[in-house]
């Protein structure tokens, strides 16, 4: 080994990778946001719409104030890695009703993907837990109708946003404690 | 500029003791995690261990588990490597690194022989 | 046997464009997991090179770039230069070690 020498800064830090966490997920949600009521305009939903593959929301406002890191990053990895199976699968199995939104929904998966690589980063940095704790994959079918499908998309996008808008709270409050 | 300056190396006996410090400055190391690596002489690198920002998570490679402690002190920016029970193998130059290995020390040579 | 599987050497004349692969598997880059690459020139410590498959530090230059498909990843090095001749390691984090993992390296020579 060489004598002591002094290395530049990499240009992301994990406070860095944080703000920038927020910045995605802000995104991601105006943009779940937009999309969501572009599916109500062209396919007015009759009520709450809901799918039993999709991860249960993660926190409530009573929870917020005592988020820990690790929890809040791990369970914002496995949720949004389970939208973005149903997002794939929308795309995939969507039928043709769905295909108006095409643009729309990969543009979508496009951000999700972004956003997780960001998350795995910085919990990387942090030397977080890495391994997703093993929760069973339920397999996504066709949808049973055109209907269903459209059903189901309400379905994912409202819950996806959901967990996006905690989400944000949640990594803002995160930033005071790193 | 970042610097991670290790220290502690030293020749040592198969089966006794040593206690590797690094010493971090320019950069927030208690927003890191910090990882210990290893390059025997002429070889490649070889993960040993890992602690997280604030000490809570610590890992091990097989090689070393139940022999070697990872620890650090963020009031003094210090990240340490107690390793007990040395063997042959286990001579190398020990480097430590910040988080996905960002930032890099120079090294300390720990040799192990009779 | 390194976790992640790297060749050996590699060789190239300046100018020329070479790539390193890294091949890993399904508990390590194909889990989805980034990959980090890194240089080490002859009698110094590693330093980063790519990180999350095709980030570059500043500092690097966009002669090198990283990609990642399926559970291989790749570094190219565009624009050869002498000053390129270094040991090349890939990293990524592998479940069933629960612990980052590195290539075995390769030894690129400028010739």
């Known amino acids: 080994p060489g004598p002591p020498a002094g290395s530049p800064r990499v240009s992301s830090d994990p406070r860095a990778d944080l703000d920038s966490a927020v910045l995605l997920t802000r995104s991601l949600l105006a943009d779940t946001r937009q999309l969501a009521a572009q599916m109500r305009d062209k396919f007015p939903a009759d009520g709450d719409h809901s799918l039993d593959s999709l991860p249960t929301l993660a926190m409530s406002a009573g929870t917020l104030g005592s988020l820990q890191l690790p929890g809040v990053l791990t369970r914002l990895r496995v949720d949004l890695m389970s939208y973005l199976r149903h997002v794939q699968w929308l795309r995939r199995a969507g039928g043709p009703s769905l295909k108006t939104l095409e643009p729309e929904l990969g543009a979508l998966q496009a951000r999700l993907e972004r956003l997780l690589r960001r998350l795995q980063l910085l919990m990387s940095r942090l030397a977080l837990p890495q391994a997703a704790p093993d929760q069973p994959v339920i397999p996504l079918g066709p949808p049973a109708s055109a209907w269903g499908s459209i059903r189901a998309a309400h379905a994912i996008l409202g819950g996806l946003h959901l967990t996006l808008d905690w989400a944000v709270r949640g990594l803002l409050l995160l930033k005071t404690r790193l | 500029e970042v610097q991670l300056l290790e220290s502690g190396g030293g020749l040592v006996q198969p089966g006794g003791s040593l206690r590797l410090s690094c010493a971090a400055s320019?950069?927030?190391?208690?927003?890191?995690?910090m990882h210990w690596v290893r390059q025997a002489p002429g070889k490649g690198l070889e993960w040993v261990s890992v602690?997280?920002?604030?000490?809570?998570?610590?890992y091990y490679a097989d090689s070393v588990k139940g022999r070697f402690t990872i620890s650090r002190d963020n009031s003094k920016n210090t990240l340490y490597l107690q390793m007990n029970s040395l063997r042959a193998e286990d001579t190398a130059v020990y480097y430590c690194?910040?988080?996905?290995?960002?930032?890099w020390g120079q090294g300390t040579l720990v040799t192990v022989s009779s | 046997q390194s976790v992640l599987t790297q060749p050996p050497s590699a060789s190239g004349t300046p100018g020329q464009r070479v790539t390193i692969s890294c091949t890993g598997s399904?508990?390590?880059?194909?889990?989805?997991?980034?990959v980090h690459w890194y240089q080490q020139l002859p009698g110094t410590a590693p330093k980063l090179l790519i990180y999350s498959n095709n980030e570059r530090p500043s500092g690097v230059p966009d002669r090198f770039s990283g990609s990642k498909s399926g559970t291989s990843a790749s570094l190219a090095i565009s624009g050869l230069r002498s000053e390129d001749e270094a040991d090349y390691y890939c990293a990524a984090w592998d479940d069933s070690l629960n612990g980052p993992v590195f290539g075995g390296g390769t030894k690129l020579t400028v010739l």
């Open positions: 602690i997280s920002y604030d000490g809570s998570y610590k």
């Open positions: 690194a910040a988080g996905v290995f960002d930032y």
């Open positions: 320019g950069f927030t190391f208690s927003s890191y995690g």
């Open positions: 399904s508990s390590n880059i194909g889990a989805g997991y980034d």
